[in-house]
């Protein structure tokens, strides 16, 4: 069966939107009005992995681009990157481990935990226009909570 996907945008708990910053990086900043058109639209695919009521494995691709968020070890540190893939083969139900995130719903907020690096989360900084990154702490200064807006 083909993998089920939906299109959405994400905003962090401070209501910052995610936009492209160069070819292989996302940054988070406040957008208003027509500038909201800059925000990236994700193709969120529901993939194979350990699932529970509040934890669902997903892959996060960029709509109409052959780019996926992936988590790899760089200089011995878990790192978030945008990775190019062959569009003929993606998305697929069985994604490689580095592409899988556990979408965790808590109090109407979403967290995205790396399946490859447990307790590491897609994160944004409090500061404006900083890169989206993989962070190893929750509840600290960095933001790990998001809301999702469906896009038709």
């Amino acid at each position: 069966a083909p993998v089920r996907s939906l299109h959405c945008t994400l905003r962090d708990a401070q209501l910052k939107s995610l936009v492209m910053s160069g070819p292989y990086e996302l940054k988070a900043l406040h957008l208003q009005g027509q500038d909201l058109e800059q925000q990236v639209v994700f193709s969120m695919s529901f993939v194979q992995g350990e699932e529970s009521n509040d934890k669902i494995p997903v892959a996060l691709g960029l709509k109409a681009k052959n780019l996926y968020l992936s988590c790899v070890l760089k200089d011995d540190k878990p790192t978030l990157q945008l990775e190019s893939v062959d569009p003929k083969n993606y998305p697929k139900k069985k994604m490689e481990k580095r592409f899988v995130f556990n979408k965790i719903e808590i109090n109407n907020k979403l967290e995205f935990e790396s399946a490859q690096f447990p307790n590491w989360y897609i994160s944004t900084s409090q500061a404006e226009s900083m890169p989206v990154f993989l962070g190893g702490t929750r509840g600290g200064q960095d933001i790990t909570d998001f809301t999702m807006q469906f896009v038709s």
């Epitope: 070890l73 069985k94 490689e96 490859q116």
Partner: antibody, heavy 120, light 107 residues
Framework: EVQLVESGGGSVQPGGSLRLSCAFS??????????VGWIRQAPGKGLEWVSH???????SYNPSLKGRFTISKDTSRNTVYLQMNSLRAEDTASYFC????????????WGQGTTVTVSS | DIQMTQSPSTLSASVGDRVTITCRAS??????LSWYQQKPGKAPKLLIY???KLHSGVPSRFSGSGSGAEFTLTISSLQPEDFATYFC?????????FGQGTKLEIK
């Protein structure tokens, strides 16, 4: 020191089954990011990745196997298994287990291999 | 599946020579490539990972380079213990696939 030791190989007729074991020491398959794979090598041929299991139980298989093989683990016994069913002559090979950590994979430590012969 | 093609299949060289083995992928595999050495009757040994990172304990005469779809393993000055078969492995996409191997033999 990391060690992996394969066992369970032998001769079997086409259509038969075998279960290979990979007993390991020096690391734990409950450590996040840890994985163990099976790689085989037909006599005089190259290497072919067969299957893989991650610390969290996530499994992957080479689609060329068409669902005939199943990988599993017993974390408490430090052992990974490869159940091979509906064996064919082309499954004749040395089967190695190997350890990796994280995706993308590279196999850091290997066992010495166990030989599987499928022949009538 | 991603096809990995190694060249040459066999390479004759002498001690002290500089040799290069090439591995080509059928599509872009980023830098998700590793190299292994195997001697007859033995298990493979990891030499290089992430295209160019030397595995611990591997002599510095071994080096790796490349990106995208073309990669090389270079041995700067062949030693007697280097005569073996060498394989590349791509980790970009499942199923993970090896090159067919390059046998390095004494000239």
């Amino acid at each position: 020191e990391v060690q992996l030791v394969e066992s369970g190989g032998g001769s079997v007729q086409p259509g038969g089954s075998l279960r290979l074991s990979c007993a390991f020491s020096g690391f734990s398959l409950s450590t996040s990011g840890m994985g163990v794979g099976w790689i085989r090598q037909a006599p005089g041929k190259g290497l072919e990745w067969v299957s893989h299991i991650w610390w969290d139980g996530d499994e992957s298989y080479n689609p060329s196997l068409k669902g005939r093989f199943t990988i599993s683990k017993d974390t408490s016994r430090n052992t990974v298994y490869l159940q091979m069913n509906s064996l064919r002559a082309e499954d004749t090979a040395s089967y190695f287990c190997a350890r990796n950590r994280y995706d993308p994979p590279w196999f850091v430590d290997w066992g010495q291999g166990t030989t599987v012969t499928v022949s009538s | 599946d991603i096809q990995m093609t190694q060249s040459p299949s066999t390479l004759s060289a002498s001690v002290g020579d500089r040799v290069t083995i090439t591995c080509r992928a059928s599509q872009d595999i980023s830098n998700y490539l590793s190299w292994y050495q195997q001697k007859p009757g033995k298990a493979p040994k990891l030499l290089i990972y992430y295209t160019s990172k030397l595995h611990s304990g591997v002599p510095s005469r071994f080096s790796g380079s490349g990106s995208g779809a073309e990669f090389t393993l270079t041995i700067s000055s062949l030693q007697p213990e280097d005569f073996a078969t060498y394989f590349c492995l791509q980790g970009k996409m499942l199923p993970w696939t090896f090159g067919q191997g390059t046998k390095l033999e004494i000239k």
